[in-house]
Amino acid sequence: AVDLTLLANLRLTDPQRFFLTCVSGEAGAGRGSDAWGPPLLLEKDDRIVRTPPGPPLRLARNGSHQVTLRGFSKPSDLVGVFSCVGGAGARRTRVIYVHNSPGAHLLPDKVTHTVNKGDTAVLSARVHKEKQTDVIWKSNGSYFYTLDWHEAQDGRFLLQLPNVQPPSSGIYSATYLEASPLGSAFFRLIVRGCGAGRWGPGCTKECPGCLHGGVCHDHDGECVCPPGFTGTRCEQACREGRFGQSCQEQCPGISGCRGLTFCLPDPYGCSCGSGWRGSQCQEACAPGHFGADCRLQCQCQNGGTCDRFSGCVCPSGWHGVHCEKSDRIPQILNMASELEFNLETMPRINCAAAGNPFPVRGSIELRKPDGTVLLSTKAIVEPEKTTAEFEVPRLVLADSGFWECRVSTSGGQDSRRFKVNVKVPPVPLAAPRLLTKQSRQLVVSPLVSFSGDGPISTVRLHYRPQDSTMDWSTIVVDPSENVTLMNLRPKTGYSVRVQLSRPGEGGEGAWGPPTLMTTDCPEPLLQPWLEGWHVEGTDRLRVSWSLPLVPGPLVGDGFLLRLWDGTRGQERRENVSSPQARTALLTGLTPGTHYQLDVQLYHCTLLGPASPPAHVLLPPSGPPAPRHLHAQALSDSEIQLTWKHPEALPGPISKYVVEVQVAGGAGDPLWIDVDRPEETSTIIRGLNASTRYLFRMRASIQGLGDWSNTVEESTLGNGLQAEGPVQESRAAEEGLDQ
C-alpha cells in the first residue's frame, strides 16, 4: 500500500487551531516537478457536505512530502469530507477523513467501518440532542432509509446493512428530519472486495494474518498497519509517538499523538494513534488495552507487562505477542518483512534462526506461496545463530506473495512470513523522440511511457546506422534529461532504441521499439561567383556562374538563384537542381526592373554562402505585335512580307525585327532588322528555292515588343542554292542579328 497518512488535529476548542496534514513516506512524493512523482493534493470535498461559503482554506507545502490545510474560521467549516491524494501512476491513492461536529444532534459511535464483502454492517448514531422527528439515513447524499424517532435503541439509531458489496462503500449520514445537515452523524463505510481473510482477483489468495488491528488489502494482500505499527504483518510496534510504514514519521507537539486522528489508505480508514481512544483521541487506553483506538487487549503471560503503545513487554527468557513463547523455543531472527526481486532472476534468500537445541541446516526451510518447500543449499553456523541460504529457482510473477521461513527443533518451532514482490523490468512502450538534428548529431528525448514496474534507475540509449550489422553503440543517460548522440555520419539514418532498468539484479528490461532518426547533410561551404549575364528579352535573363576548384567530390545538390526586386520588396527564387549546371535562363521577369542577383549552392535543406551580388536592369517592355502579317513568294529566292502597324503604340517605333526559320529545321532562327519603321512591307531575299519558311516579326521602341503571328510560305522552284536570306539589298551591309 502507498505510505500515505492524513492527520487531523482534533483539539476543537478553537477551529482556527484546527489543521489537517497529509504526510507521504513515498520516495519523491510531493515534488511534482519531475515526471516520476505527482504532487500531494489535500482538499475539502464539497460534493457531499456543502457548508456556507467562507474565506478559502490555506494550503501550505511543508518540505517535499507534507502538505497542511489551515484557515478554518468556524466549527461548521470543519464538518464534512476531506481527502488527500498521493502516490504516482497505478499507485495513486486517496485517503479520506470524515469530520463530525461535536455539537451535532446525532454522533457516530464509530466513524469508519471496514467490513468484508458479504458481511452485515451496522452503523450506529448516538443521540446527543434529541428531536422527536424521523431520522433520515443517506448514502453518498441520496436518500437511503427512514427510522421513526421511537425506533431508537438505548439512545442509538441503527442502520443494518446485510450482505454488503463493494458498491455499498461510501459516506453515510443520519439526520433528524427538519434539522440542519451540519447536525448529522457522518460515517464512512469501506467494503473490502473479498470475504474475510482473502484477497486477489477472484479472492483466491489467503491474507497474511495482519496483527494489531492491521487490515488486509483486497488487491495486493498487504497489511495496512494501524498508526504505530510496522512490518509485513504489523507485528512490530513503533516507538511511542511515531507512525508511517517504517515508523519514520513523528507526531507533532509535546503530547505526541494525543488529539490526532490518523487516516490511512483503504481498507483501513481512520483511527486514533496507538495508545489513544475517544471521539477526539484525547483519552489514554484503560489498563490492559493498547494500540490504535485501544482496540487490542494485552493478555500478557509469564510476567509480561502491558504497554498501551506496544502491547506486552516480556521479561527475560520469554517472547511472543503475549510472552507465551520461551526463549528456548527456536526463533527466526531479523527477517526482513519485505523483499523485492526482478522477474526471472534466481536470488539467494537467507534465513537466520537461534534456539536451544541449536538449529542446523536441515531444520530450516523456506515455503513459497504455492506451498513448494525449498531446502537450504548451505548454512553458516555462528555461536548465536544459524543462517540458512536458499537458492531460489527462476522467479515468475506467481511467486509474488507471502513466503515463510520455518525452523523446527525438538524445542518447538517458529515461522516468519515475509512478502516477496516480484517486479517486472520496465519495457518502453514507445520509441524515443527526436528533438533536433544536425549533420553529425541527434538530440533525443529518452523519457517514454513503459510497461512493467518502476522506479527507473537507468536509461540506456542504443543506436547504430540503419540496415547495419555492426554492434550497437550505447549511452547511459539520466532519465529526465535530453541526450545528444555525437560523432554521427551525415545524411545517415540511425536506428535508435531505449532500454530501461529498475534497481536490483536482472532489472534490465527488454529494448523498446526502434525509431529511425536521420542526420542532416553537411553544410555546403563553396561560394560561387557570378561570371556574367545578358538580357535575352524584356523578361528574360541568362545568368552564368563559377565555383572554386577544390579536391574531392562536390558537396551540393544544386544551386539557388535569388533575384531581389527592391522597389516592390519581392524576392524570386529559381532552383537549379543539378550541381553541374553553370548557367540558367530566368524567364517571366518584370520588364524595366532593377534586380539584385546572387547564387548559392545548396545541399539537402542547407544553403551555402551566397555569391557577391550583381545588379541587373531589365529593359522596359516593348510595343504590341504587328498585325495581319502575310507572306507571298515572289521568286525561287524572294518572299514579300506585308503587315499593319501595331495599335496603341506607347511611342515611335525605332525598327522592326523579322525572324526567319526553315520549317522543320533544327538550326537557330535568323533575325533581320527593318530599319524604316514607316514601312508596312519588305522583301526577304537570298532564300533557297522550293523551301518552306516560317516568318514572324516584332517592333522595337526602347525594348523589343511582342511577336506577331507566325506565317508560312514556300519559295518557287528551280533556283540555285542561295547564301542566306537578306532583307532588300542592304542585308549585306547590316549583317544578320542572331
Epitope: 457536505v49 427512514t146 421513526d148 421511537h150 425506533e151 427538519e178
Partner: antibody
C-alpha cells in the same frame, strides 16, 4: 421508473371489511416510508395512515384509528390496508403513495409524497 | 393537529393570466409545505416541496414562496394544461392537506 398499483377496492356494505393492496416497483421498497391517502367524491385529500420501512411503526388519522390496519411485506414489495367496520363516510378513492425526501447532504431534509398510485375506489353502501 | 386553509376555493382565469393561490397554517410550520396538482380522475402530482423547491420536470412558470404560516403558489402565465385543482400539504407534523383550489377556465 417508480410505479405504484393499487387493487382490492369495490362495493361493501356498512360494517363490512376490505383489504387494499399496493404493488410497488422501480425502487427499493424496503427503504421507504409508505402511506395511504383518500379522497371522497368531489372532496379534498385526506391522509389515512403511514408505515415506516421496518414495518414496526405505524400511524393513523383519528377518523380510522382502531378500524384500519396498515402493513407491508418487504419481500413482496407490497403495502396493505386492512379496513374493518366500514362506514358510508369511508367511501373514497384510496391512493397509496411513497414518502420522499429532498436530496443532497446540504439541504434541510423535508418530507413529500413524491409518487402516487392511480387509486382504487371503495364504496360503502347498503 | 395543524389545519391548512386554502383560498380561494375556486377561481376562473384565462390562458396567460397570472394566478396566485394562498395557503395558511393554523400554527407555524417553518418551510415544510408542499404543493400538489390534481386533474380530474388522476392521482395528485407533486409540484413544489419545502415551500419553494420546484420538482424536476415541473415548468418554471410555477413558483412557491412563504414560511411560518403563510404560503403562496404562483402560476406566472396560465397554460391550458394548468386547469386543475391545487392542494397544499404540511409535513411539519402529522400530514394534513388544504381543502383545495379549483382553477377553471373563464
Amino acid at each position: 421508473e417508480v410505479q405504484l398499483l393499487e387493487s382490492g377496492g369495490g362495493l361493501v356494505q356498512p360494517g363490512g371489511s376490505l383489504r387494499l393492496s399496493c404493488a410497488a416497483s422501480g425502487f427499493t421498497f424496503s427503504h421507504y416510508q409508505m402511506l395511504w391517502v383518500r379522497q371522497a367524491p368531489g372532496k379534498g385529500l385526506e391522509w389515512v395512515s403511514s408505515i415506516y420501512p421496518s414495518g414496526g411503526w405505524t400511524y393513523y388519522a383519528d377518523s380510522v384509528k382502531g378500524r384500519f390496519t396498515i402493513s407491508r411485506d418487504n419481500s413482496k414489495n407490497t403495502l396493505y390496508l386492512q379496513m374493518n367496520s366500514l362506514r358510508a363516510e369511508d367511501t373514497a378513492v384510496y391512493y397509496c403513495a411513497r414518502v420522499g425526501y429532498s436530496s443532497g447532504w446540504y439541504a434541510l431534509t423535508s418530507k413529500t409524497f413524491d409518487y402516487w398510485g392511480q387509486g382504487t375506489l371503495v364504496t360503502v353502501s347498503s | 393537529d395543524i389545519q391548512m386553509t386554502q383560498s380561494p376555493s375556486s377561481l376562473s382565469a384565462s390562458v396567460g393570466d397570472r394566478v396566485t393561490i394562498t395557503c395558511r397554517a393554523s400554527q407555524t410550520i417553518s418551510s415544510y409545505l408542499n404543493w400538489y396538482q390534481q386533474k380530474p380522475g388522476k392521482a395528485p402530482k407533486l409540484l413544489i416541496s419545502a415551500a419553494s423547491t420546484l420538482q424536476s420536470g415541473v415548468p418554471s412558470r410555477f413558483s412557491g414562496s412563504g414560511s411560518g404560516t403563510d404560503f403562496t403558489l404562483t402560476i406566472s402565465s396560465l397554460q391550458p394544461e394548468d386547469f386543475a385543482t391545487y392542494y397544499c400539504q404540511q409535513s411539519y407534523s402529522t400530514p394534513s392537506f388544504g381543502q383545495g383550489t379549483k382553477v377553471e377556465i373563464k
